[in-house]
Every structure is written in C-alpha cells, then in structure tokens.
C-alpha cells in the first residue's frame, strides 16, 4: 500500500554464508534505500525456517532481544539510530545451526521486506598421510593411507599415481557430532619396482583456498634380487686383475654376501670382497661357475655367472680386467 | 513520560467531515510513525492509516476509498486525521498510535458520533 | 486483507487459573504478531511484539508464541487486574489488521 511510482527498498544479503564449527560467524543483511525514497524501520527480526517464534529481535524502542542471549548479538542496531543494518552475528557455532535464515525489516511505508539466507556449517578437516609398508603378496593391497580428519561437509580424496592401482575410500563419523573422518586407501600389488616410487593424495574441501596435496613414498619389502655384473666374455690370460660385483636391489638393505662356486669354496685366485669379488690373474685357463648369495631380513637370493679365461692372441693386451 | 493527548468527542452529520487531533509529548515525534485506529462501540478494532512526520510519507488502509487523509504538523508535534463522507457506521472511537511495527502508545480515544 | 481469527470470542475463568487465547491468520505472516489489552473505557495497551516478546513493565504471567500462522497468548497464573478484552494484531502487510477480540472474564 505505498503510494504509486516510489523506488522500492531492497534488502541485501548473501544467499549463503559459510562459519566455522565452534567459531562465530556474522549474517550480513543491510536495508537498501534508494535516494529519494524515505522509510522508516521499527523493528528487525531473525527467524529460523521450521522453528516456531523468531531468534532475535530489534524493537525501536525496546532495543534487542534473543531467544539465546548468549549466542546472539545484533552487530550494528543500536536504540536511537536508524535501522539499516540488522547483521546478526551468532557465537559457538553448532552443526545444527545450519539452516535458512530469515532476515526482515518492518518498514513504513512500505511494509515488510525480507531476504533469505543459508548458514553453511564448516569444519577445517585435518589431513595426514602415511605410508602402509607391505610385503610382495602377490595380490592387492593399501600401500598408502590418506586420513582427512573432522570435516564438515566430507571432504573430498583423490590419488594421483604413474603406478597403476585404485583406490578404496570409507567414511566414518568424526570426534565432533557432525563432522566426518574420510579414509582412502591406495591399493595395488606390491612388487619392487614400487619401491620407493611416490603417490599423491589430494584432499579437497570447501574450508581450503586450494587442495592440500600429500605425497607418500611407498615402501614395499622383498628379498634381494641379484645379479652378477663386471664379464664381458673377453677374459685372457696374463692380463690385469678383474672385478665382479654382486648388484643386489633389495629391502631393507641386504646384511650379507657371500660368494662361492658350484665346485664348492672359492679358489684361490678368487677374492671375496663384500658385494666384490677380485679375480686375480692366472696362468692357465679356467672355467668357472661363481656364486653370490646376499642375504637380507625377509630371506637369501642368489645368482650365478660362469667365468672363462682364455688363450688370447698377443695382440689384445687388454684382458681380464673390465674396469 | 510518553503522551499522546487526542481532541475532544464529536458529533457530526451524514456526508460531513471530522478533524482530530494527536497531541505528542515525552519523545521525539519526527522519530515515530503516528497512525489512526478506530473502534465501534462494543466491536473490534480497525486500522485507517499512518504517517511518518519526517517524510510526510503515508499508507491509507484501501477501505476508507479516499475518505481519510492523516497529516502531521511538526512544529507542535501533533497528527491530525480527517475522514470525510462520513456515515452512521464511522461512528467510533478513533485512537491515534504511536507505531513501532506494533502499536506501543495510544491516545485516549475521541468518540466521534454521525447522526442525522 | 490478512484475516485474524481469534478464539474463543469470550471466556471466563478463575484467578490462579491458566488462560489460553489463540488467534489464527489467514496466511502466513512470520512472526509479526502483537498482542494487546484493553480494560474496560481505556485504549489498548501493548504486551507482547514480534509474537513472543513481552513490553518492558508487562508481567512475566503473560507470554506469547507462535510463527506462522498460529499465535498463542498465555496468562500463566491469571490476576484480577487482568478482567480485559485481548486483541491479536498482525503487521506483516499492509492493511493492518486485529483479531476481533477475546472478553475475558474473571469467575
């Protein structure tokens, strides 16, 4: 019923506005009026969409008013000013303070005028990962664990990996009522070549400016692979000392090597140096099997190389030695 | 102390108009919008209209068609209200109200009789 | 026109007793509710504002709730001084209107 032509007054408020568990948070509402137009505001009230009676009141002459005085506070109304701004800030935050909100304005002569808005109630997730070190099983399983820790929505995990696998994600209530704790699982067959590799845990969730990204180094335990490296076919005699090394790729590190042959112990042109075996030089031709057996905490392995010193023609001076 | 002072009883003719008056003390009167109320004897009450006195800006409720015109003289912080055409069934008491949303002061009342 | 019904049109009851007054709206109109009370030859007086907020200097006897569409006044232990007639008015949307009444009588 106001008069015919006037502007209208507005009233502006965000149509959402995220807070904190626990923390405060302010709901913005403003009364817009344009230049010309006069109104005059007599009271300001917050309700709640589904609950009965209003939360908060501003009166013009009685002042505020809170159905929970503690948690409720009118951020700008004061008695004797205009009332422009009837922002409400609520203290403590719950999760069931999530919800729709109204804000209204009681003006003259325009009437009522109100706005609604949604108060998002979040929780900053903690995020950890970690590495779950496995055994070569021969079938699936988690060699990474990422935790997003009391998030309020759920937060969001995925994994990034050039190693193949999938992941397996569970939710679980978290400590505080309403929040939620996000468990994935990166799963796949351990072998060596994982070893040591890293994966990527990316945990995305609306608290965060930008996902958290926590990388995992994945350890995965097995038995020495060996191998014999230092021959090359081109042995002859009367030529320098030669090496062969016992290459072992293993986890943890091997504890031991020990060399040997098929015939038995090692002859003795044949020096056992740890992962080196130093082949001194010889008068006559050999034909030899050599042995290396390393040894870690999850067992032994071992790998074989037949050696032979030949008869060279003199012009090929280089020899037995490869290094 | 908040006061709202209203002129005396009248009584009028069918088809003529009456002025009453609101007379405000205790508070600042371009603070508060004033409006009018009427009550027939023994029934309900009713809403005629408002007026802020800064502005000037009124509402009219739509029954009174034009009949009703609130104005406010800010020098001497008093409304008046003046309803034209009137008829036996405005006979009332019409009570001016300090207006907070709700209605929080209110005059004493002025009985304002129609009849031939 | 936003209609209000309240009920019932009259009552009477005894001092000490628990008075109920409801008043009903014909659409919703939040929580923008007053409730008054007007003793015989006097103008009404403002109780309750916003549907549950009681005037400073009114008795904590009386309390109002509601949103909506339906309103409640209470008078918790009822008084002699409270012989009155009780008006729910409702100031969502223009025009305003009142409840039609409650006369309450003491027994």
């Known amino acids: 019923w106001p008069p015919p032509g006037t502007g209208d007054i507005i009233v502006q408020a965000p149509t959402q506005v995220p807070g904190f568990l626990g923390d405060s948070v302010t709901l913005p509402c403003y009364l817009q009026v344009p230049g010309m137009e006069e109104t005059h505001v007599s009271q300001l009230t917050w309700s709640r969409h589904g609950e009965s009676g209003s939360m908060a009141v501003f009166h013009q002459t009685q002042g505020p008013n809170y159905s929970e005085p503690k948690r409720l506070e009118f951020v700008a109304a004061r008695l004797g000013t205009e009332l422009r701004d009837a922002s409400l800030r609520m203290f403590g935050l719950r999760v069931e303070d999530e919800g729709n909100y109204t804000c209204l304005f009681v003006t003259f002569p325009q009437g009522s005028r109100s706005v609604d808005i949604w108060l998002r109630v979040l929780a900053k997730p903690q995020n950890t990962a970690e590495v779950q070190k496995v055994q070569l099983t021969g079938k699936p399983v988690p060699v990474a664990r990422c935790v997003s820790t009391g998030g309020r929505p759920p937060a969001h995990i995925t994994w990034h990996s050039d190693l193949g696998g999938m992941p397996n994600t569970s939710q679980a209530p978290g400590f505080l009522s309403g929040t939620v704790t996000v468990t994935s699982l990166w799963i796949l067959v351990p072998s060596s070549q994982v070893d040591g590799k890293s994966v990527t845990c990316k945990v995305e969730h609306e608290s965060f400016e930008k996902p958290q990204l926590l990388t995992v180094n994945l350890t995965v335990y097995y038995p020495p692979e060996v191998s014999i490296s230092g021959y090359d076919n081109n042995w002859y005699l009367s030529q320098n000392e030669a090496t062969l090394t016992c290459d072992a790729r293993s986890n943890p590190e091997p504890t031991g090597y020990n060399w040997s042959t098929t015939m038995g112990p090692l002859p003795p042109f044949a020096v056992a140096q740890g992962a080196q075996l130093l082949i001194r030089p010889v008068d006559k031709p050999i034909n030899t099997t050599f042995i290396c057996n390393v040894t870690n905490a999850l067992g032994a392995r071992q790998a074989e190389l037949t050696v032979q010193v030949k008869e060279g023609p003199p012009s090929e001076p280089s020899g037995m030695s490869s290094n | 102390e908040v006061q709202l002072v209203q002129s005396g009883s009248e009584l009028k003719k069918p088809g003529a108009s009456v002025k009453v008056s609101c007379k405000t003390s205790?508070?600042?009167?371009?603070?508060?919008?004033m409006h009018w109320v009427r009550q027939p004897h023994g029934k309900g009450l009713e809403w005629i209209g408002g007026?802020?006195?800064?502005?000037?800006?009124?509402s009219y409720n739509q029954r009174f068609k034009g009949r009703v015109t609130i104005t406010v003289d800010k020098s001497t912080s008093t409304a008046y209200m003046e309803l034209s055409s009137l008829r036996s069934e405005d006979t009332a008491v019409y009570y001016c109200?300090?207006?907070?949303?709700?209605?929080?002061?209110w005059g004493q009342g002025t009985l304002v009789t129609v009849s031939s | 026109d936003i209609q209000m019904t309240q009920s019932p049109s009259a009552m009477s009851a005894s001092v000490g007793d628990r008075v109920t007054i409801t008043c009903k709206a014909s659409?919703?109109?939040?929580?923008?509710v007053a409730w008054y009370q007007q003793k015989p030859g006097q103008p009404p007086k403002a109780l309750i504002y916003?549907?549950?907020y009681r005037y400073s200097g009114v008795p904590d006897r009386f309390s109002g709730s509601g949103s909506g569409t339906d309103f409640t006044l209470t008078i918790s232990s009822l008084q002699a001084e409270d012989l009155a007639e009780y008006f729910c008015?409702?100031?969502?949307?223009?025009?305003?209107?009142f409840g039609q009444g409650t006369k309450l009588e003491i027994k």
């Open positions: 205790g508070y600042t009167f371009t603070e508060y919008t």
């Open positions: 008015q409702q100031y969502e949307s223009y025009p305003y209107t």
């Open positions: 007026i802020h006195p800064n502005s000037g800006g009124t």
């Open positions: 916003s549907a549950s």
């Open positions: 109200a300090r207006w907070t949303g709700d209605f929080d002061y």
């Open positions: 659409q919703n109109v939040g929580t923008n």
